[in-house]
Interface confidence: low
């Protein structure tokens, strides 16, 4: 209930997060024409990446464009990108769509298409579907770990939403273990409403709400989170527009003195911790 | 309309192999993804392989991972059905279909026969034991 008397101010917060967990990735691997099974291991810096702010990433799914180098090409025939003769390429032109800049030269892309050469990292990156089941799928099961300090300045006082009594293999759970601060992406999911299966191939924003109510009167204090979750981006976008969370990221190596990159589309889920509440003292 | 005509069933021993075509009528066939289906007396069709309209993506069935291979000609407007080391459960009636490209990333949806919008009149393949 809503104390009257009391002063309130917002909290103050800081969140630091470790995830933690092993994945075991099986998939289609292509050489020389031959395609095999490989297998991988990825382990939290396979998956993760460093976020500004209060924010942390798992990579569930990816598709990857290998042995690229700086050279020239013919572009992906997407729709619309197909030519006929060097007319339809305009040299010096980038197109937001293209992955390069037209030389003004129509070239065969295959046996049959024709498209625009462009200097590029080559090949260039085909429009490939995100994998189905999820390649990381398995990252269901990993934990984090969310270390949250808070401050009210207002009433000097500071807290942190680990106690020095708490269990380091604890997994939260809303009716048993609502303290514990470790948590199984796959039951953030549940708890969500969300299915981590079907989310994971796409990708997906998860929001990970902490609520602070303190009351910092010496006679009845209580000061402790109260962790509850939410899907943040908008599962019902259109499939053609975009949906889901992805970006793109680089593996640089040289092979024989030639400069080469891995270029790899990462699909994930973005966990953004929102710390919110307040403080109130006679 | 686009519309699809099978060919290349038959009757072929156990181990043998057959190689189904499915010819498109002229338009932009090369918009569309393609998929063959199978249906067996009494039972729902079922998927067996698809290719994307990029040509790029190819899916397969787990039953006949290894034994079948698709393959599209976008400038003959045809899908081909490699069938090899056929089986007598094999035997049924096959199906080509086309599923227009409505962009995103569909792939996992081509084994569904809701995202095909036209279909063939099915050739019949028969393996005998």
């Known amino acids: 209930s809503d104390k009257l008397y009391q002063r309130k101010e917002p909290v103050i917060s800081s969140v630091h997060t470790k995830v933690k967990g092993i994945a075991e990735v099986t998939e289609n691997v292509t050489e020389g024409g031959v395609t095999k099974l490989g297998h991988s291991i990825f382990d939290t810096a396979d998956y993760t990446f460093p976020l500004q702010g209060n924010s942390f990433f798992v990579m569930t799914n990816y598709v990857k464009s290998e042995g690229q180098v700086q050279t020239l090409c013919p572009e992906y025939p997407r729709r619309g990108a197909q030519c006929s003769s060097d007319r339809r390429c305009k040299k010096g032109w980038m197109d937001p769509q293209s992955k390069g800049i037209q030389t003004g030269r129509c070239v065969p892309y295959d046996k049959t298409r024709k498209t625009c050469e462009v200097s590029a990292w080559c090949p260039t990156e085909e429009e490939k579907e995100a994998p189905r089941p999820a390649l990381l799928r398995s990252a269901e099961n990993f934990t984090v770990l969310i270390k949250n300090n808070i401050h009210f300045p207002g009433h000097n006082y500071t807290t942190r939403n680990i106690l020095p009594t708490m269990n380091g293999s604890c997994t939260f759970h809303k009716t048993w273990d609502p303290q514990c601060s470790i948590f199984r992406l796959g039951d953030i999911f549940q708890e969500a409403g969300e299915n981590f299966t079907e989310v994971a191939v796409q990708g997906g924003i998860m929001g990970i709400e902490i609520y602070w109510d303190c009351n910092l009167d010496s006679w009845s204090h209580h000061c402790r989170p109260r962790y509850s979750f939410r899907r943040l981006d908008d599962k019902n976008t259109d499939e053609s527009f975009v949906p889901g969370y992805n970006f793109r990221y680089a593996k640089y190596y040289k092979e024989n003195n030639v400069e080469k990159r891995t270029l790899i589309k990462a699909f994930g889920i973005r966990f953004d911790i929102l710390v919110f509440g307040t403080g109130g003292k006679f | 309309e686009m519309q699809l005509v099978e060919s290349g069933g038959g009757l072929v021993q156990a181990g043998g192999s057959l190689r189904l075509s499915c010819a498109a009528s002229?338009?932009?066939?090369?918009?569309?993804?393609m998929g063959w289906f199978r249906q067996t007396p009494g039972k729902e069709r079922e998927f067996v392989a698809a290719?994307?309209?990029?040509?790029?993506?190819?899916y397969y069935a787990d039953s006949v991972k290894g034994r079948f291979t698709i393959s599209r000609d976008n400038a003959k407007n045809t899908v081909t059905l490699e069938m090899n080391s056929l089986k007598p459960e094999d035997t049924a009636v096959y199906y080509c279909?086309?599923?227009?490209?409505?962009?995103?990333?569909?792939?996992?949806?081509?084994?569904?026969?809701?995202?095909?919008?036209?279909w063939g009149q099915g050739t019949q393949v028969t393996v005998s034991s």
């Open positions: 290719t994307s309209w990029s040509d790029i993506s190819t």
């Open positions: 002229p338009g932009t066939f090369s918009s569309f993804n």
């Open positions: 279909a086309a599923g227009y490209y409505r962009g995103g990333y569909l792939g996992y949806r081509l084994t569904l026969e809701g995202s095909y919008d036209v």
